[in-house]
Interface confidence: medium
């Protein structure tokens, strides 16, 4: 019988030959257990793996922790591709994060970040992040050193006023801290003075709640 | 709708002991921190005590008033805060409100606790 | 314990005029303050958090502002029903506290 090939992430797939962006099963380490992720082939060589797409409020991101433990939404929209998928793959080796934005007035920034993980489960999908350049903020809008993740069921953040419930979405709150981007989708002209959308402040201050985020990541060595 | 009913409260006498007892509907109750607040009579509000979630291992805070003499617990499945209040003072007399997550948004009708001789 | 200083204790106003209350925080809080209102035998109201934020489904008239130590609840145009107990909070640590309160009076 034939082994099937498999891919531990979209710079897997694109190695293998497969570089057209879209959607393709990654395996997760060390198991049989497959997720489908969107693979962006093209932005800076490609072999990107999205890990969160916001942009047009179609899927709520108020979502329960085990739900941004497995993901939810679909990869070739809205989505999050799942904490536990990302906790285990960056564990692996080392990963970079890439995170583009785009306002409403058509601009666009990105953040990127030479060393990415999340911690496990246990440690509640604790973010590590090292080496911040880009154009969108010279500090770094999730704060520093990294916070647990928060949802509305399971709230990890340093704050008393339970940041997850108000700010809505899942992230990895301080008290609350500079940045959400699965904060509430406003449309254009109702995008500002909101303490609860998709925030990126050292880019966009505190009110402005962006149009569209992507974060996606690749092994530092791609 | 929200409600928060609270029922426990009543005359008791200096060193006696009350359970007060605060229902919660009309939202995801094991989502949200459970706070006590007290009001004596013609005074201002004073935070008594906070209950966590499950996800903190229901952890939690007192005021320093109210430290070793009164207990904060939940019960997840009869979507029910209680406050347990021992070794009660004559100026632990107020009314009490059960409260959700500061900043309070949802407030009970309160419930009286007289500690008198 | 973080003190927060209300003032002024009480005041007089009559209907349409503009009010405004006054908080100090004793140290930094960052934006961790509320606003309630109460009325006489009823349970305090969120007016405000994040010391400018309005709660779902109060009116317009009711602005919060300021950052640090010194807060401000203002009543742009002062209704009948506005006349009431007003108190600040802070929610950025433990213990959590309240001003001592803003009686609203007819004049």
């Known amino acids: 019988k034939e082994e099937q090939i498999t891919f531990r992430d979209c710079a897997d797939v694109f190695r293998s030959g497969l570089t057209t962006s879209g959607i393709y099963t990654l395996t997760f380490p060390n198991s049989t257990e497959e997720t489908k992720a969107y693979c962006d082939m093209e932005t800076g060589g490609g072999g990107w793996t999205t890990i969160q797409r916001r942009e047009d409020g179609s899927v709520d991101f108020q979502r329960t922790w085990k739900e941004y433990k497995v993901g939810f939404g679909n990869p070739s929209g809205e989505h999050w591709l799942g904490n536990e998928f990302v906790s285990q793959l960056t564990n692996q080796q080392r990963y970079v994060l890439k995170i583009h934005l785009r306002d409403w007035e058509g601009n666009e920034a990105y953040s990127l970040y030479e060393h990415f993980y999340l911690s496990s489960e246990e440690f509640n999908y604790r973010i590590h992040l090292k080496g911040l350049t880009g154009t969108a903020g010279k500090i770094s809008s999730i704060s520093q050193p990294g916070n647990d993740f928060s949802t509305k069921d399971a709230d990890n953040d340093k704050c008393i006023c339970k940041c997850s419930q108000m700010l809505t979405g899942g992230w990895w709150f301080d008290a609350c801290g500079p940045s959400n981007l699965n904060g509430m989708y406003y449309p254009q002209r109702q995008n500002t003075n909101k303490f609860n959308g998709i925030k990126w402040y050292y880019w966009k201050g505190s009110g402005y709640s962006l149009k569209a985020t992507t974060m996606m990541i690749r092994p530092a060595d791609f | 709708e929200v409600q928060l009913v609270e029922s426990g409260g009543g005359l008791v006498k200096p060193g006696g002991s009350l359970r007060l007892s605060c229902a919660a509907s009309?939202?995801?109750?094991?989502?949200?921190?459970m706070n006590w607040v007290r009001q004596a009579p013609g005074k201002g509000l004073e935070w008594v005590a906070e209950i966590r979630l499950k996800s903190n291992n229901y952890a939690t805070h007192y005021a320093e008033s109210v430290k070793g003499r009164f207990t904060i617990s939940r019960d997840v499945s009869k979507n029910t805060v209680y406050l347990q209040m021992n070794s009660l003072k004559t100026e632990d007399t107020a009314v009490y409100y059960c409260t959700d997550t500061a900043p309070f948004a949802y407030w009970g009708q309160g419930t009286l606790v007289t500690v008198s001789s | 314990d973080i003190q927060m200083t209300q003032s002024p204790s009480s005041l007089s106003a009559s209907v349409g005029d503009r009010v405004t209350i006054t908080c100090k925080a004793s140290q930094d809080v960052g934006t961790d303050v509320a606003w309630y209102q109460q009325k006489p035998g009823k349970a305090p109201k969120l007016l405000i958090y994040w010391a400018s934020t309005r709660h779902t489904g109060v009116p317009s008239r009711f602005s919060g502002s300021g950052s640090g130590t010194d807060f401000t609840l203002t009543i742009s145009s002062l209704q009948p029903e506005d006349f009431a107990t007003y108190y600040c909070q802070q929610y950025s640590s433990y213990p959590l506290t309240f001003g001592g309160g803003t009686k609203v009076e007819i004049k």
């Open positions: 009309g939202f995801t109750f094991s989502n949200y921190w």
